[in-house]
C-alpha cells in the first residue's frame, strides 16, 4: 500500500507527484524537490518535506530554552541534503560553502564552519517538547480528556504509537506534549517522533501536509482547542557543540 490507488494521490503528502507507473501499474508517488519515491501509507520524512518546501518563505523564530542542551529551530528553512532513506545527512552546507552539523530533525547543533567541518554521525533527537498556548476558553480543559485526545490524534493522524507520547502536561493555557523515542525503542515501521512533530507543527499552523483532507479540527469533549502559539524544543542523545560565543 503506497498510495490511494483509485485516484493515484498520496494521502500523507500533498507535495508529491503521483502516477500509475509502479509495478503492475500501481500508483507511485515521488516527493517534489528530490524526486524520491515515498511510502504514502506513513509520514514522509521531514528532510524530504523541507526539500519540497524550499520555495516557501523563511520561517525563523527564537525561543526560550527549557534546558541547557535543548535546541530550537532558529535557522528556519533551508534546502537540506537527504540520504537515500530520506533522512538528513549529518553535514549540511549552503551554496556559499558554509557548513554545519544537524540532528535527526535537521536542526543545527554546531557552529557554522567551512567545507572542512566534519560531522561524524547523525545524532538522534530522542526527546521533543511541544509547547502550546491555547486561546482562552470558557474554562480549563479536563487534563485527562486533553491527554486522551492528543494521544488519539498522534496515533490516528500521525501514526505514532502512544508509547512514544511520554506525557501531556497542562497548566492553563499552556499545554506541553513530550515525545520520546530512543534508538533502541524505534522498531522498523515506527514513525519517527521528529516527523510526527513536524506534521503536527504544520497542522497547528494551518499548513497541513495531508492530501485533500480538511485542516486539523482539534476538539476536547466537543470544545475547540485553538492554538495561538507553538514552541518546539529538541533534545539530542548527545548534547550539541556550540562555542561559548554563541551562548553569551
Amino acid at each position: 500500500h503506497t498510495a490511494a490507488q483509485d485516484n493515484c494521490t498520496c494521502p500523507t503528502n500533498k507535495m508529491t507527484v503521483c502516477s500509475p507507473d509502479g509495478p503492475g501499474g500501481r500508483c507511485q508517488c515521488r516527493a517534489l524537490g528530490s524526486g524520491m519515491a515515498v511510502d504514502c501509507s506513513t509520514l514522509t520524512s521531514k528532510c524530504l518535506l523541507l526539500k519540497a518546501r524550499m520555495s516557501a518563505p523563511k520561517n525563523a523564530r527564537t525561543l526560550v530554552r527549557p534546558s541547557e542542551h535543548a535546541l530550537v529551530d532558529n535557522d528556519g528553512l533551508y534546502d537540506p541534503d537527504c540520504d537515500p532513506e530520506g533522512r538528513f545527512k549529518a553535514r549540511q552546507c549552503n551554496q556559499t560553502s558554509v557548513c554545519w552539523c544537524v540532528n535527526s530533525v535537521g536542526v543545527r547543533r554546531t557552529d557554522k564552519g567551512d567545507l572542512s567541518l566534519r560531522c561524524d554521525e547523525l545524532v538522534r533527537t530522542h526527546h521533543i517538547l511541544i509547547d502550546l498556548r491555547h486561546r482562552p476558553t470558557a474554562g480549563a480543559f479536563n487534563h485527562s480528556d486533553l491527554d486522551a485526545e492528543l494521544r488519539r490524534l498522534f496515533r490516528e493522524r500521525y501514526r505514532l504509537h502512544p508509547k512514544f507520547v511520554a506525557a501531556v502536561h497542562y497548566e492553563q493555557p499552556t499545554i506541553q506534549i513530550e515525545l520520546r523515542q530512543n534508538t533502541s525503542q524505534k522498531a522498523a515501521g515506527d514513525v519517527d517522533i521528529g516527523d510526527a512533530a513536524y506534521y503536527f507543527e504544520r497542522d497547528i499552523k494551518g499548513e497541513s501536509l495531508f492530501q485533500g483532507r480538511g485542516g486539523l479540527d482539534l476538539r476536547v469533549r466537543g470544545e475547540p482547542l485553538q492554538v495561538e502559539r507553538t514552541l518546539i524544543y529538541y533534545l539530542d542523545e548527545i548534547p550539541p557543540k556550540f562555542s561559548m560565543k554563541r551562548l553569551t
Partner: antibody, heavy 119, light 111 residues
Framework: QVQLVQSGAEVKKPGASVKVSCKAS????????INWVRQAPGQGLEWMGV????????SYNQKFKGRVTMTRDTSTSTVYMELSSLRSEDTAVYYC????????????WGQGTLVTVSS | DIVMTQSPDSLAVSLGERATINCRVS??????????MHWYQQKPGQPPKLLIY???NLESGVPDRFSGSGSGTDFTLTISSLQAEDVAVYYC?????????FGQGTKLEIK
C-alpha cells in the same frame, strides 16, 4: 452512544473464505482504528490485526498474514475482515473492537460473529 | 511476541471477599511511566468489557471495587468485595507491541 454491530453467523467449508462486517455508529468513524480479535470455542482471545479507518491500511498479526484482509468503507462507516483458506481451527467467534483514546486499549466491542468451518 | 501469563487459572472467592488476579509479562510494557497493560471482563456469550486501562485507570462506568496495579512486568487486578455479577473470565492484555497479546484468562467463581 458508540455501537459496533457485526454481521450474522456463517458456516463455511474448509478452503473457503469468509467476510465479516462491523458497522460503527455514535462517533466519527475515521477518528478511531478498529481491531479484530477472535476467540475459539472455550479458548482465550487472539488479536488478528488493526485497520486505520483514517488511512484505510491495516497491520496484521504475522500469524494471519497472507490469509487476512481488513478493509473499510467510510461512506457506510463499516469495517470488513476477510479470512481465506479456512480450516477447522478457524472456527471461532470474531470480534471487532475500537481503540480507546489514549493507550491502545479496546474500549468498545462488537457483539461477535460465529464462524463455523466444517466439511 | 510478548507472552502474558495469568495466575491463577481459576479462582473461587466468597461473596464480599477480595479477589486478586495476577498477570506476568515476558518483557516490560512500560514506556516512560505509561504501562500499556489493560484488563477485561468477559461473561458467557458476551464480548469482553474493558475494566482497567494503562494498568491502573478505571474505565468510565466500571464500579470502583475494581482496581489495577503494577508496572513493568508484574500486574494485578483486584476486586475489593466480590459481588455475584463479577463471576466471569478476566483477561490481561498488552498493547505495547504488535502483535498485541492476551493472558490465557482467569475464571472467577463464587465459593
Amino acid at each position: 452512544q458508540v455501537q459496533l454491530v457485526q454481521s450474522g453467523a456463517e458456516v463455511k467449508k474448509p478452503g473457503a473464505s469468509v467476510k465479516v462486517s462491523c458497522k460503527a455508529s455514535g462517533y466519527t468513524f475515521t477518528d478511531y482504528s478498529i481491531n479484530w480479535v477472535r476467540q475459539a470455542p472455550g479458548q482465550g482471545l487472539e488479536w488478528m490485526g488493526v485497520i486505520s479507518t483514517y488511512y484505510g491500511d491495516a497491520s496484521y498479526n504475522q500469524k494471519f498474514k497472507g490469509r487476512v484482509t481488513m478493509t473499510r468503507d467510510t461512506s457506510t462507516s463499516t469495517v470488513y475482515m476477510e479470512l481465506s483458506s479456512l480450516r477447522s481451527e478457524d472456527t471461532a467467534v470474531y470480534y471487532c473492537a475500537r481503540y480507546g483514546d489514549g493507550y491502545n486499549q479496546f474500549d468498545y466491542w462488537g457483539q461477535g460473529t460465529l464462524v463455523t468451518v466444517s466439511s | 511476541d510478548i507472552v502474558m501469563t495469568q495466575s491463577p487459572d481459576s479462582l473461587a472467592v466468597s461473596l464480599g471477599e477480595r479477589a486478586t488476579i495476577n498477570c506476568r509479562v515476558s518483557e516490560s510494557v512500560d514506556s516512560y511511566g505509561n504501562n500499556f497493560m489493560h484488563w477485561y471482563q468477559q461473561k458467557p456469550g458476551q464480548p469482553p468489557k474493558l475494566l482497567i486501562y494503562r494498568a491502573s485507570n478505571l474505565e468510565s462506568g466500571v464500579p470502583d471495587r475494581f482496581s489495577g496495579s503494577g508496572s513493568g512486568t508484574d500486574f494485578t487486578l483486584t476486586i475489593s468485595s466480590l459481588q455475584a455479577e463479577d463471576v466471569a473470565v478476566y483477561y490481561c492484555q498488552q498493547s505495547y507491541e504488535d502483535p498485541y497479546t492476551f493472558g490465557q484468562g482467569t475464571k472467577l467463581e463464587i465459593k
